[in-house]
Amino acid sequence: TLNSVLNSNAIKNLPPPLGGAAGHPGSAVSAAPGILYPGGNKYQTIDNYQPYPCAEDEECGTDEYCASPTRGGDAGVQICLACRKRRKRCMRHAMCCPGNYCKNGICVSSDQNNFRGEIEETITESFGNDHSTLDGYSRRTTLSSKMYHSKGQEGSVCLRSSDCATGLCCARHFWSKICKPVLKEGQVCTKHRRKGSHGLEIFQRCYCGEGLSCRIQKDHHQASNSSRLHTCQRH
């Protein structure tokens, strides 16, 4: 588990898995951009690596993360850097190559400590498979039986979107998974570029509502190095 990284708060039992939101059948939950643990990059770029300017990890490829190329990290200038392989130093999950995650400052295999199981559980749920056992989750958190008698309202805890009332989906919200509203036009959404990254997010958003898609905000006032938002826009 990730307990060793989530280091400074008392947790009686293991926290719910990072991620784990259930989405609309056939549509993955939109999750917030992939910086899970704060801290700028302090590592050098790799030679012969073609720089691509970015504001956040999701703008980079599957095998990349977004960070300052210089030691000490001027956050104003960031480019996509090659992901860090197993046993290399890291400061957040996105820095590690696919199949690995950041634990105690080192990229380790997702196979260790059942972490992969948590991600797979998330992916299974995200595509609306309500028949999944969710063993990794249910052993840790017991929902009130009331949840199954009435559909969850906005902000109430959930395991999957079918637990939530119409117009809501089940999505990760920092400490927990709760029922959140399906997004309306103009609301912030998240477009995923990094494969599987939704399994690591702590702020997940629902999908955009009918007739809407998640696109980058067209705003000429925003500087190119700013963190560009995606919003739900008409097709």
């Epitope: 989530l6 280091n7 400074s8 708060n9 008392a10 947790i11 009686k12 039992n13 926290p15 719910p16 917030a32 951009p33 910086i35 899970l36 643990y37 704060p38 801290g39 700028g40 504001a55 956040e56 956050a75 960031q78 840790r140 958190t141 017991t142 929902l143 009130s144 009331k146 949840m147 009435s150 969850g152 309202q153 906005e154 902000g155 109430s156 805890v157 919200h173 920092f174 400490w175 927990s176 709760i178 959140k180 103009g186 609301q187 912030v188 998240t190 702590i202 702020f203 958003r205 700013s226 963190s227 938002l229």
Partner: antibody, heavy 116, light 112 residues
């Protein structure tokens, strides 16, 4: 409608203890995470602690860790904050807040004064 | 530690628009695009006005809107009214300490 009512505040000496309660109504208490947030006189808001819907997870601000304990009784729709080893800097209005999508409902607060 | 910086005070006349800023770092606001805003009148409990950057809870006037660019989130109040005079706090989360974090607060004064 959602209602949160805090009680248990008062004057206490440094090193003393106090237990705050928050009675919840108007929503399914057992389906929501709950939090305590405090505000020192004339100061800003400071998050104190949060507890999961089933009490399995608790988190605390560094400033209160090891001294305060959050708990809840879902059968009584009540949230608690046990405060031990109180210090002058703990003087504040303590708010009980429902943590749905962020702190979406708040009580009116109860004043805790730590002074000799 | 994560710290959210807000101006101590802002002011505006009735009918005007004002904007309150909340500045973090690339590790928090700039990184995970999440911020909420609360309004607090003197002697009253805070009230959630905006969540997830730009979403309004039901019952909150559409004169209140949120946005974010880079490491700075903003709360804009248009058509300023006397009852908008209050303290406003931004809020996000610290993913290392697993805690909620509030900005220092901004006192909004409606002139005249």
């Amino acid at each position: 409608q959602v209602q949160l009512v805090e009680s248990g505040g008062g004057l206490v000496q440094p090193g003393g203890s106090l237990r705050l309660s928050c009675a919840a109504s108007g929503f399914t208490f057992s389906s929501y995470w709950m939090s305590w947030v405090r505000q020192a006189p004339g100061k800003g808001l400071e998050w104190v602690s949060v507890i999961s819907s089933d009490s399995s997870s608790t988190y605390y601000a560094d400033s209160v860790k090891g001294r305060f304990t959050i708990s809840r009784d879902n059968s009584k729709n009540t949230l608690y904050l046990q405060m031990n080893s109180l210090r002058a800097e703990d003087t504040a209005v303590y708010y009980c807040a429902r943590h749905g999508i962020d702190f979406d409902h708040w009580g009116q607060g109860t004043l805790v004064t730590v002074s000799s | 530690d994560i710290a959210l910086t807000q101006p101590a005070s802002v002011s505006g006349s009735p009918g005007q628009s004002i904007t309150i800023s909340c500045t973090g770092t690339s590790s928090d606001l700039g990184g995970y695009n999440y911020v909420s805003w609360y309004q607090q009148h003197p002697g009253k409990a805070p009230k959630l006005m905006i969540y997830d950057v730009n979403n309004r809870p039901s019952g909150v006037s559409n004169r209140f809107s949120g946005s974010k660019s880079g490491n700075t989130a903003s709360l804009t109040i248009s058509g300023l009214q006397a009852e908008d005079e209050a303290d406003y706090y931004c809020q996000t989360y610290d993913q290392i300490k697993l805690s909620a974090v509030f900005g220092g607060g901004t006192k909004l004064t409606v002139l005249g």
